[in-house]
């Protein structure tokens, strides 16, 4: 655990796993007041590397539905409409925080947990494996 | 407030703002032990959208080091190294859930925040706004 | 296939309280959030509050804060929507809709709501 | 709270014809724009979520654009069973809002 005096005002707990259990408060706060965060909401259709967005769902989970970036095409859009298979369209992939209630059906106790998320497409020059 | 009957090993909790302040286990579980997230860590390199990473730190959140991506260029990085401005760069954003400490330095208190960060970028047809 | 079957039509006296029910069927009941929308004759729609059974808290609109509690039951699948201090201007039909609140396009808590009930008709007379 | 100011408030359509309903809200509200149909004496039901984003079982000669303050729902090549009203809402910024909804009719 993270070597901080105990403040005074701080929560006390006394439990076995402190650190590790911790009290947080869950009314999320949003720290991107100033922007509007949904506009690159058409990206997925304006790119030269595509994507669909396919659905992920877990009820145990928050959040339950979670969608996910499927790269269209293997190779890039051209100015042409057409596709050139000489780049590659690719995910552009990123951890994101999750709450699983643990143990499950407990109102008010949850776990964090790490997931890998695939959020977008961007096209790159692929590597090419010369065989000697 | 919900209703659903305290079960049986269930955390209980005297705080007044409950349930918006819950226990969390920080104990992270990764589900995606079987996929490395760093395979598309060269792609901020050989994308035709590049990018630079810059590191953003902050002792009181969890993570405390977060990477932003930062497009290189205005346009698209054409087959032959040049620049084409006919085509944006743009970031791929995408919220992360992050735990800042609330109060500041308390070692067990925490507040789950929602923070907005440029994932990588991708290249896409400008919108072009034509005047009457 | 989801389903939000809501509770029967009501006929109240000013000054009392309506409570609603709103049971859903066929998909995840927690990980959603339910919505109440009501209503009011010939007019369009009110957006009244929501609750988040994953967490067990509700957000309402500032119209209706102090007057209407919004609850929900795991075990039985089961929304409620209580409105007090009932006058005339209540009248309305009361919907209640699921909201994914999903993670979409990058973005947690995306909201619409893409099923609804069949409504539940509430007449404030005296 | 966020307005949504429609139009037209109303539209008298033969059948075939191409529709163009407008939303336009009172602040910015990216792509947080939903539209719904609601048929007499029906629930509300979900037609495109996020501005241009297709429902399944929608029928595809429905589609959405727009996006910040500006949104347009278009039903290219009306059918007689798209009589009703419909309804824009935004889910940017609490509380939710609908527009005042655009009743279509059948000539």
């Known amino acids: 655990g993270i070597a901080i005096p105990r403040n005074s005002g701080c929560p006390n707990s006394e439990d076995k796993n402190f650190p590790r259990t911790v009290m947080v408060n869950l009314n999320i706060h949003n720290r991107n007041t100033s922007t509007n965060p949904k506009r690159s909401s058409d990206y997925y259709n304006r790119s030269t590397s595509p994507w669909n967005l396919h659905r992920n769902e877990d009820p145990e989970r928050y959040p339950s539905v979670i969608w996910e970036a499927k790269c269209r095409h293997l190779g890039c859009v051209k100015a042409d409409g057409n596709v050139d298979y000489h780049m590659n369209s690719v995910p552009i992939q990123q951890e994101i925080l999750v709450l699983r209630r643990e143990p499950r059906h407990c109102p008010n106790s949850f776990r964090l947990e790490k997931i890998l998320v695939s959020v977008g497409c961007t096209c790159v020059t692929p590597i090419v494996h010369h065989v000697a | 407030g919900i209703a659903i009957p305290r079960n049986s090993g269930c955390p209980n909790s005297e705080d007044k703002n409950f349930p918006r302040t819950v226990m969390v286990n920080l104990n992270i579980h990764n589900r995606n032990t079987s996929t490395n997230p760093k395979r598309s860590s060269d792609y901020y390199n050989r994308s035709t959208s590049p990018w630079n990473l810059h590191r953003n730190e902050d002792p009181e959140r969890y993570p405390s080091v977060i990477w932003e991506a930062k497009c290189r260029h205005l346009g698209c990085v054409k087959a032959d190294g040049n620049v084409d401005y006919h085509m944006n760069s743009v970031p791929i954003q995408q919220e992360i859930l992050v735990l800042r400490r609330e109060p500041r330095h308390c070692p067990n208190s925490f507040r789950l925040e929602k923070i907005l960060v440029s994932v990588g970028c991708t290249c896409v047809t400008p919108i072009v706004h034509h005047v009457a | 296939e989801v389903q939000l079957v809501q509770s029967g039509a009501e006929v109240k006296m000013p000054g009392s309280s309506l409570k609603i029910s709103c049971k859903a069927s066929?998909?995840?009941?927690?990980?959603?959030?339910i919505s109440w929308v009501r209503q009011a004759p010939g007019q369009g729609l009110e957006w009244m509050g929501g609750?988040?059974?994953?967490?067990?808290?509700?957000d309402y609109a500032q119209k209706f804060q102090g007057r209407v509690t919004i609850t929900a039951d795991e075990s039985t699948t089961t929304a409620y929507m209580e409105l007090s201090g009932l006058t005339s201007d209540d009248t309305a039909v009361y919907y209640c809709?699921?909201?994914?609140?999903?993670?979409?396009?990058?973005?947690?808590?995306?909201?619409?709501?893409?099923?609804w009930g069949q409504g539940t008709t509430v007449t404030v007379s005296s | 709270e966020i307005v949504l100011t429609q139009s037209p408030d109303f539209q008298s359509v033969t059948p075939k014809e191409k529709v163009t309903i407008t939303c336009r809200a009172s602040?910015?509200?990216?792509?947080?724009l939903h539209w719904y149909q609601q048929k007499p004496d029906q629930s509300p039901k979900l037609l495109i979520k996020y501005a241009s984003h297709s429902v399944s079982g929608v029928p595809s000669r429905f589609s959405g654009s727009g996006s910040g303050t500006d949104f347009t729902l278009t039903i290219n090549g009306l059918e007689a069973e798209d009589a009703g009203t419909y309804y824009c809402?935004?889910?940017?910024?609490?509380?939710?809002?609908f527009g005042p909804g655009t009743k279509v009719d059948i000539k």
């Open positions: 809709a699921r909201d994914p609140n999903e993670f979409w396009n990058g973005y947690y808590d995306t909201h619409h709501f893409d099923y």
């Open positions: 809402h935004q889910s940017d910024i609490l509380p939710h809002t």
């Open positions: 602040q910015d509200i990216g792509s947080a």
């Open positions: 609750i988040t059974p994953f967490f067990g808290w509700a």
């Open positions: 066929g998909g995840s009941f927690r990980g959603y959030g």
